[in-house]
């Protein structure tokens, strides 16, 4: 579960800022990339690279852009309508159980197991028992075969919320 958006996640807009475009709300809502003014009369654009909004909304503030952590690479920048897309660096992955950090992928499979899945930004290498074909779970014994993983593959986000 993502954390509740708190006040510090919101980026207050300076109402008088000349670079911020304004338009009128449509039935009380402002389009993605904007937030509503306090008096409800205007839609004020989010600041590129600083904050964003993804949906038609009546938010008083745009949402603050995520900064990628060390160990992550920026896959795509924060725009006025999208948050930053962060991805674990090559050779590391993000687990559902510990989404706060990228963990190093294992370098190979334990003896008696074969590699059937590579290290990806969202999963460790996948090992199965040679005979049964059942997946390995849990800690890896110290002795490993020389089956090494090849990082690679489509991008996956590290940071899923603003």
């Amino acid at each position: 579960e993502s954390a509740l958006i708190t006040q510090q996640d919101l980026a207050p807009q300076q109402r008088a800022a000349p670079q911020q475009k304004r338009s009128s709300p449509s039935e009380g809502l402002c389009p993605p990339g904007h937030h509503i003014s306090e008096d409800g009369r205007d839609c004020i654009s989010c600041k590129y690279g600083q904050d964003y909004s993804t949906h038609w909304n009546d938010l008083l503030f745009c949402l603050r852009c995520t900064r990628c952590d060390s160990g992550e690479v920026e896959l795509s920048p924060c725009t006025t309508t999208r948050n930053t897309v962060c991805q674990c660096e090559e050779g590391t992955f993000r687990e559902e159980d510990s989404p706060e950090m990228c963990r190093k992928c294992r370098t190979g499979c334990p003896r008696g197991m074969v590699k059937v899945g590579d290290c990806t930004p969202w999963s460790d290498i996948e090992c199965v028992h040679k005979e049964s074909g059942t997946k390995h779970s849990g800690e890896v014994p110290a002795v490993e075969e020389t089956v090494t993983s090849s990082p690679g593959t489509p991008a996956s986000p590290c940071s899923l919320s603003g």
């Epitope: 579960e1 993502s2 954390a3 509740l4 958006i5 009380g28 809502l29 993605p32 993804t54 949906h55 038609w56 909304n57 009546d58 949402l63 995520t66 896959l75 795509s76 999208r82 948050n83 930053t84 897309v85 489509p154 991008a155 986000p157 940071s159 899923l160 919320s161 603003g162």
Partner: antibody, heavy 122, light 107 residues
């Protein structure tokens, strides 16, 4: 683990109002991180997004259905509801509620309710 | 509205086959595309987002690619549990729209 469950009558008469409720468990609708959507699937398998609601009560509807749709939220019950007025046989579909992970980098629907079939017939 | 067109509408394949499904948007949607898998009587299951990123727990035999208007979902080695209908969905603008679906059937 967030789970969603639709409930409501499976049979509605033409010209009447279809009413469905989605109950969310394992997470709070009041989290500002999500929008809450209704999606329907016609017998011919086409999926159609109906609209969403935010915990604050702000809504946005598919323009093709806007004149007939109302989505509301009851945060105290952790539920949101769909009303579709003046229904015809063309509104016969499986109706799904889904969470829209839309306050982050992406917009996708996950998880979904199991769906409820609503037949419009006299 | 952005129209999403999938092809083929159905494909017959065997276990172990490589299967490719394409999705075309009527206008550019950058990489804001998701893929879902649906089995009969079940809700769609979310597979891929931002065109190429796998949802946690989705097998690595699934992959997505593309940007702009043309996108591809590939299943590298079809497994028995992969026989289903697959849908693409654009998340570039409102209203959100889906492709008409591609049914992957047993040959």
């Amino acid at each position: 683990q967030v789970q969603m469950q639709e409930s409501g009558p499976g049979l509605v008469k033409p010209s009447q109002t279809l009413s469905l409720t989605c109950t969310v468990s394992g997470g709070s609708i009041s989290s500002g991180d999500y929008y809450w959507s209704w999606i329907r699937q016609h017998p011919g398998k086409n999926l159609e997004w109906i609209g969403y609601i935010y915990y604050s009560g702000s809504t946005y509807y598919n323009p093709s259905l806007k004149s007939r749709v109302t989505i509301s939220v009851d945060t105290s019950k952790n539920q949101f509801s769909l009303k579709l007025s003046s229904v015809t046989a063309a509104d016969t579909a499986v109706y799904y509620c889904a969470r829209d992970n839309g306050s982050g980098s992406y917009d996708w629907f996950d998880p979904w309710g199991q769906g409820t079939l609503v037949t419009v017939s006299s | 509205d952005i129209q999403m067109t999938q092809s083929p509408s159905s494909v017959s394949a065997s276990v172990g086959d490589r299967v490719t499904i394409t999705c075309r948007a009527s206008q550019g949607i950058s990489s804001w595309l998701a893929w879902y898998q649906q089995k009969p009587g079940k809700a769609p299951k979310f597979l891929i987002f931002v065109a190429s990123s796998l949802q946690s727990g989705v097998p690595s035999r699934f992959s997505g690619s593309g940007s702009g208007t043309d996108f591809t979902l590939t299943i590298s080695s079809l497994q028995p549990e992969d026989f289903a209908t697959y849908y693409c969905q654009q998340a570039n603008s409102f209203p959100r729209t889906f492709g008409q679906g591609t049914k992957v059937e047993i040959k």
